[in-house]
Structure formats: C-alpha cells, structure tokens
C-alpha cells in the first residue's frame, strides 16, 4: 500500500483552520489480524528522510493523536486531549485520514507528516508517510482563506517507507 | 506524570502461575499498544508480548506463545500478564512498557522480579 | 526471528572519550532500529529511534547512524552519568528483538 497526499502545500491566513489529509492507496489487506495505526506529527526536510524525525504539532506527541479503530475502521482521536489544543484528527471508510488545526497561529507553519503503520501477526511492520508543508501567514500579503496546492503526482504517489 | 507500575511478582514453584499487573498513570492508557519485556539476573533483555488499544491484536515471541497470555482492563488503566507452566529460566525482572507501532519501547515500569524456584 | 549482534562486549573508556557502539542485524531492517541505556537497578530508556533520531530529553552527545544491517551508536564526549549497559532494538517485524548489550565501563 501507499500514502498520496492530496495536496504539498497549505497556505493559510492566522485565526483560520485547515485540514490537512493524507490517502491510504491500495491494495489494501482488510484480513482480520492486521491493523492499520495512523498517527500525524511535525518534522523537517532532512537531508537523507524527510518526516524521519517525530516532533510534537502543538505540544502533542504521534502517540497522542493516532487514530484508534473501532469496530467500523472510520476512527477519531476523540480524546479531550487533542481537542484542547484545538486538534482532531480523523479518518473514514475510504481510506482517507486528516488532522484538523484550529485557530491557526504563525508558529503553526511547518512540515507536517501523516504515518501509516501495517502490522500484521509475525511480518514486517510496513510503514509509509505522507509530507506536507503550511505556511500560515499573516498581514496584507495573507489570502483570506487556505489556499491549497495539489501535489504533482509524482510527490503523491511516490511514497516511500518511513 | 507519564508512570507505570507493575505488580504481582515474587516467588512461585516451578509449574506454578502467576498474574502480573501494570497500572499506568499520566498518558491515555485506552489508546495506547502496551508490551511486556523481561531480563533475567544479569542477562539482556528479551520482548514477551504485545497488545493492541482494545485488546484485539495479540503478539508473543514464539518461546511464549503457549504459556503466557496478554490483556488489558482499560477502565482500570491496567495492563496483565498471566503466566502459567512457569519454569526455573523464567526467572527474571518483568517490566512493562509502552510501544507505540513503528518506534521504540518509550515509557517502562521499574519492573517486578518473578522467581521460580522450589 | 531477526538476530542482533552488538560490538564490542565491553568498552573501557575515560571520561571525555568517544564512545562507539555497534549493532548488525542478520537481515536488512531499513532504518527501524532503536538505542536504549540501562543504568544498575533501573529501567532501560530510549535513547535513539528510527537508527538516528533522538528521543525527547536526550542529550545531543547521542548520535546515532546506519542502515539496512549496520549501526552505529556515539557518544561524542563521555559524562559520568553515561557509562551503562546500552541495547540495540529492532522494530522491523515481531519478534522483537534485542542485541545482548554492549557495557561501557570507566578505564
């Protein structure tokens, strides 16, 4: 399987929110021993990886905003925790997954990860990530909305592993 | 503060059983991958099992499969460990700790000592 | 099962000193391998994930390298605090496993 990112770059005015989203592309197992643990964090471009390096998105860690499954595979970080620092992150039965930023802030820009993690009972636990960049900007050069730039489709599907 | 405790270790015959319990403190328990790893007296360490959020996913190294059994009670924020058959070379400190899936052992308990031994 | 090796057994070094550690894997585990310390009577901690990334609190005389099968762990100046037993751990695939450790003594 692979991630797609929709779109590389978000330009958005502060005060405003965004919704950044990643697309787990298939063939996807849906067998009943494997399970899919997606998360979200901040990184950098490095020079050898990019999104290799975990850094909290305002104050929360990947562990906080993974997306726990129920028994219908939508999921949501429905905890309190991510919802006081205006954060939800949430995915639905296509595949699709995101993290909504609230009441953006200039120390909000920044490059964004999405993970994917496959375990399966005794394999190799496959991961694949998505990148993206925000710019929140702020002054008489600010767009009044989010403005988003599709990836090329060689940035969306030449997904490698984390 | 990000804790875990374990409890239940001491001294059982071999044959014996024994239930281990982790309680955690300061993280969202319910939605946390939880494992148990163990070092016997002077040895490495060595990963015993693991256990998904909602207690659905189970993994064990092969030497445990048979013999101990994972689970969680997430309304009491505790993880357990129920070993049966036990022997003599399962003598060691049990710890347990939290493994988010694709990183590292992150958060451990300061361990409980397990001796078996008649 | 994937098998980890760590080189040398022991390190006897002094304070101040360069400390290298190394980790083979039998088989290619990308960059999926961890670092932690254990100090006498405690817990071991992560110190470096993903072979090159430092855990939250490390400090920056931890550095970690390699990938496919080697890897490597410096400590680029000794403190007191640092000599312990230091492991290797493969995320890669269940079985997880460990090296058998590497100890770093004071010379």
């Known amino acids: 399987f692979k991630v797609a990112t929709p779109y590389s770059l978000y330009v958005c005015p502060e005060g405003q929110n965004v919704t950044l989203t990643c697309r787990l592309l298939g063939p996807v197992d849906k067998g009943h021993d494997v399970t899919f643990y997606k998360t979200w964090y901040r990184s950098s471009r490095g020079e050898v990886q990019t999104c290799s390096e975990r850094r909290p998105i305002r104050n929360l860690t990947f562990q906080d905003l993974h997306l726990h499954h129920g028994g219908h595979q939508a999921a949501n970080t429905s905890h309190d925790l991510a919802q006081r620092h205006g954060l939800e992150s949430a995915s639905d039965h296509h595949g699709n997954f995101s993290i909504t930023m609230r009441n953006l802030t200039l120390l909000d820009s920044g490059l964004y990860c999405c993970l994917v993690v496959e375990i399966r009972h005794h394999h190799s636990e496959h991961r694949v990530h998505g990148a993206m960049e925000l710019q929140v900007q702020t002054g008489k050069d600010a767009p009044s909305n989010c403005v988003v730039y599709p990836s090329s489709s060689q940035d969306s599907e030449n997904i490698t592993a984390a | 503060e990000v804790q875990l405790l374990e409890s239940g270790g001491g001294l059982v015959q071999p044959g014996g059983s024994l239930r281990l319990s982790c309680a955690a403190s300061?993280?969202?328990?319910?939605?946390?991958?939880m494992s148990w790893v163990r070092q016997a007296p002077g040895k490495g360490l060595e990963w015993v099992s693991r256990?998904?959020?909602?207690?659905?996913?189970?993994d064990y190294s092969p030497s445990f499969q048979d013999r101990f059994t994972i689970s969680r009670d997430n309304s009491k924020n505790t993880l357990y460990l129920q070993m049966n058959s036990l022997r003599a070379e399962d003598t060691a400190v049990y710890y347990c700790?939290?493994?988010?899936?694709?990183?590292?052992?992150?958060?451990w308990g300061q361990g409980t000592l397990v001796t078996v031994s008649s | 099962e994937i098998v980890l090796t760590q080189s040398p057994g022991t390190l006897s070094l002094s304070p101040g000193e360069r400390a290298t550690l190394s980790c083979q894997a039998s088989?290619?585990?990308?960059?999926?391998l961890n670092w932690y310390q254990q100090k006498p009577g405690q817990a071991p901690r992560l110190l470096i994930y993903?072979?090159?990334n430092r855990a939250t609190g490390i400090p920056d005389r931890f550095s970690g390298s390699g990938s496919g099968t080697d890897f490597t762990l410096t400590i680029s100046r000794l403190e007191p605090e640092d000599f312990a037993v230091y492991y290797c751990?493969?995320?890669?695939?269940?079985?997880?496993?460990f090296g058998q450790g590497t100890k770093v003594e004071i010379k």
């Open positions: 751990q493969q995320s890669y695939s269940t079985p997880f496993t």
């Open positions: 256990v998904n959020p909602s207690d659905s996913h189970t």
């Open positions: 993903d072979a090159s």
């Open positions: 300061g993280f969202t328990f319910s939605t946390a991958w």
């Open positions: 700790a939290r493994v988010p899936p694709g990183y590292g052992f992150d958060i």
């Open positions: 088989q290619d585990i990308t960059n999926y």
